[in-house]
């Protein structure tokens, strides 16, 4: 947060530990920038709906780091 | 009953710290943001920052970033804001409030602060 | 950080006249600009968000309009206990930032 260069706000204003990974389509994850300080993770349901996960979510962790390390910015 | 009850009028000497308290009762605490905003006499209105009960996250203004700390107790629905290195610059009301609801779901759309709590006077003096 | 200019500074005016009150800001902030009524001793209260949106339980006298960064807040009819600051808000980026307010007094 800057008081000269301005933050957007992030996409997640609210996230959720209980999704079963089962239900889950496609994740994406979304790195710390311009556009909001912290790591984002839509998770795109099966049925159609995205969701905000929380990135310090265990079964979530592992999967994070390796999209990040791996330079992805979507995945 | 929606409320936000802010902790007692303090007093404090230059170089304090202060600490208020926010205690959201009659709603979902971690469906809303909470935002400090401080209003000295006299003045606008100016936003100190805020903090998601939901992650714990804070988000500061850089004025403060490095005075001042928004914490949350979500055992008790209460959000707490430390203010050190106080100043007599520093005397205001500070005001809690909160922003929302939201949901589980990805939006760029804002709610404004529609809950207020009934603010708390800090008066630095020596 | 972002500008909101509001103006007039002061508007006076008698009960039952229109108010317009305008708040420009110095880059486009999308929707996300909310209106704020304060009157003396008193916690801020919400009265439009999102550019538009009525809040529950304030008076349909109460309307707002305008986009990126242009924004008006209107009062069709003013009632006595309209007379009071008015602050306009921004919370698409941080810094949230409000506007320097504007005073609708008696005429």
């Known amino acids: 947060v800057s008081a000269v260069l301005t933050e957007l706000r992030c996409t997640c204003l609210r996230v959720t530990l209980r999704v079963n990974p089962k239900t889950i389509g496609k994740l994406q994850v979304f790195p710390a920038g311009p556009q909001c300080s912290k790591v984002e993770v839509v998770a795109s349901l099966k049925n159609g709906k995205q969701v905000c996960l929380d990135p310090e979510a265990p079964f979530l962790k592992k999967v994070i780091q390796k999209i990040l390390d791996s330079g992805n910015k979507k995945n | 009953q929606v409320q936000l009850v802010q902790s007692g009028a303090e007093v404090k000497k230059p170089g304090a710290s202060v600490k208020v308290s926010c205690k959201a009762s009659?709603?979902?605490?971690?469906?809303?943001?909470i935002h400090w905003v401080r209003q000295a006499p006299g003045q606008g209105l100016e936003w100190m920052g805020n903090?998601?009960?939901?992650?714990?996250?804070?988000n500061y203004n850089e004025k403060f970033k490095s005075r001042v700390t928004m914490t949350r107790d979500t055992s008790t629905s209460t959000v707490y804001m430390e203010l050190s290195s106080l100043r007599s610059e520093d005397t205001a009301v500070y005001y809690c409030?909160?922003?929302?609801?939201?949901?589980?779901?990805?939006?760029?759309?804002?709610?404004?602060?529609?809950?207020w709590g009934q603010g708390t006077l800090v008066t630095v003096s020596s | 950080e972002i500008v909101l200019t509001q103006s007039p500074a002061t508007l006076s005016l008698s009960p039952g006249e229109r108010a317009t009150l305008s708040c420009r800001a110095s880059?486009?902030?999308?929707?996300?600009l909310h209106w704020y009524q304060q009157k003396p001793g008193q916690a801020p209260r919400l009265l439009i968000y999102?550019?538009?949106r009525s809040v529950s339980g304030i008076p349909a006298r109460f309307s707002g309009s305008g986009s990126g960064t242009d924004f008006t807040l209107t009062i069709s009819s003013l009632e006595p206990e309209d007379f009071a600051v008015y602050y306009c808000?921004?919370?698409?980026?941080?810094?949230?930032?409000f506007g320097g307010g504007t005073k609708v007094e008696i005429k």
């Open positions: 999102y550019t538009s």
């Open positions: 009659g709603y979902e605490f971690t469906s809303y943001w």
């Open positions: 409030a909160r922003e929302g609801p939201y949901s589980y779901y990805p939006s760029r759309q804002y709610y404004g602060s529609d809950l």
């Open positions: 808000g921004q919370n698409n980026e941080w810094p949230e930032v």
């Open positions: 903090i998601s009960p939901n992650s714990g996250s804070a």
């Open positions: 880059q486009s902030i999308s929707n996300n």
